[in-house]
């Protein structure tokens, strides 16, 4: 979380902004709030980028103002305007690109005074695991498959029954390049299971952490999937 | 659940002063702008001024400049509106109301004011 | 300030028919403007807001359109709950400023 406060003038607002990451290829969000004002026609918003010459996006007399708009942002941004009133200038920004990856800034002018906050925003590719019985290995195996992860992460397994064991030596992962040239399938496979145990598949880069479940018994089998942005700082 | 509940009906005698309250529960009273808005019996909406209550920043209706003072408990989450020199045309039902999620978006019950001599 | 002209004051209509309520303001307010119902004895309720959305709970028989100085809002097919007194507000500009009502009554 970062908050800054205006510097320059009479009055300052705090403008609060979360460090966040955005999944390449789809839409994210970089998040700003700021002490609202309740004169929607004094509200400016603007979205600036470290080392972009023309501005992210602009807010302003109600409306987007994107006459100074950066090419490489056109058509792809937007604010939640009816939620500007009641303080929130978060970007919603589409089909998220690897190049997006830096540092913004919020700038908010308001009717009380002026504010800004940084934010770091991170891209790269994650996803869901998900964690099979192999029915076509020749011993009790699992298959853990995750379609999109960029960059190249670590995978770990683990055990409810051997906790703290090292799974390295009994399985294999493999990264297969998709046809976009920059993300990967992650497969990795687990041999010599057994019965009445939880498995998890741990896939973890420097933005996201995953984990997938599977709880495998002589009646059933029982799976969980969970995802975690390793980067929500605020500021 | 986002609750407004504001104090009881009043009388008062011409020239004198009225305190409504509005106890605010469900959402954070210090980070949203609150506002006050009168009706007339009979009459359309009229809206009288917002409190900021996290800077007790206060925005007044030109109309009501002067002789209206809005206030904030932030301790107890609840708003004051306070309107002196009453004169019968003061007589109206008083609402505070939140501007949360969007514009006027919660209202307390109302509050009857009656002037009369 | 913003005026804002609701049309008509009032209107007669039954059960089932599509009921239209227009509001005007003196200057263009974007996109700034929400509508609300209210009937007597209740404080006002949020319907609809930055124009078109649809508050929380609000039936989708309810609509709203318009953008600048010209706004509607449209109750398709009007059912027995819905006759009430109905005001627009634009919170584009200070101050926020209400419409005069619309009352819907039964015919």
């Known amino acids: 979380l970062i908050i800054g406060f205006g510097i320059s003038g009479r009055h300052s607002i705090t403008v609060t902004t979360v460090a966040s990451a955005g999944n390449i290829g789809e839409d994210g969000i970089l998040s700003c709030t700021f002490e609202p004002d309740i004169k929607l026609s004094d509200i400016v918003i603007q979205w600036l980028k470290e080392g972009v010459l023309g501005l992210v996006h602009e807010f302003k007399e109600g409306k987007d103002e994107l006459s100074e708009q950066d090419e490489m942002f056109r058509g792809r941004t937007a604010v939640f305007a009816d939620q500007v009133i009641v303080g929130n200038a978060s970007l919603r920004l589409k089909n998220v690109q690897l190049t997006d990856a830096g540092t913004y800034k919020c700038y908010i002018i308001t009717s009380k005074g002026k504010g800004n906050a940084n934010l770091e925003y991170k891209t790269g590719a994650f996803s869901m695991p998900e964690v099979n019985v192999d029915y076509n290995a020749s011993s009790e195996t699992l298959r853990c498959e995750a379609p999109r992860w960029f960059p190249q992460p670590t995978v770990v397994w683990a055990s409810q029954v051997d906790q703290g064991a090292n799974f390295s030596e009994v399985s294999n992962t493999s990264f297969e390049l998709n046809s976009e040239n920059v993300t990967m399938k992650v497969v990795s496979v687990l041999y010599n299971v057994t019965i009445n145990n939880t498995y998890s598949c741990m896939i973890e880069n420097d933005i996201a952490k995953a984990t997938g479940d599977i709880k495998v018994t002589e009646s059933e089998i029982k799976r969980r999937s969970h995802l975690q942005l390793l980067n929500s700082k605020a500021s | 659940e986002v609750q407004l509940v504001q104090s009881g009906a009043e009388v008062k005698k011409p020239g004198a002063s009225v305190k409504v309250s509005c106890k605010v529960s469900g959402y954070p009273f210090t980070s949203y702008w609150m506002h006050w808005v009168r009706q007339a019996p009979g009459q359309g909406l009229e809206w009288i001024g917002a409190i900021y209550p996290g800077k007790s920043d206060t925005e007044y209706a030109p109309k009501f400049q002067g002789r209206v003072t809005l206030t904030a408990d932030t301790s107890t989450s609840t708003a004051y509106m306070e309107l002196s020199s009453l004169r019968s045309e003061d007589t109206a039902v008083y609402y505070c109301?939140?501007?949360?999620?969007?514009?006027?978006?919660?209202w307390g019950q109302g509050t009857t004011v009656t002037v009369s001599s | 300030d913003i005026q804002m002209t609701q049309s008509p004051s009032s209107l007669s209509a039954s059960v089932g028919d599509r009921v239209t309520i227009t509001c005007q303001a003196t200057q263009d307010i974007v996109k700034s403007l929400n509508w609300y119902q209210q009937k007597p004895g209740k404080p006002p309720k949020f319907l609809i807001y930055?124009?078109?959305q649809l508050a929380e709970g609000v039936p989708s028989r309810f609509s709203g359109s318009g953008s600048g100085t010209d706004f509607t809002l449209t109750i398709s097919s009007l059912q027995p709950e819905d006759f009430a007194t109905y005001y627009c507000l634009q919170f584009y500009e200070f101050p926020p400023t209400f419409g005069g009502g619309t009352k819907v009554e039964i015919k």
């Open positions: 109301t939140s501007t949360w999620t969007h514009y006027f978006d919660y």
């Open positions: 930055y124009t078109a």
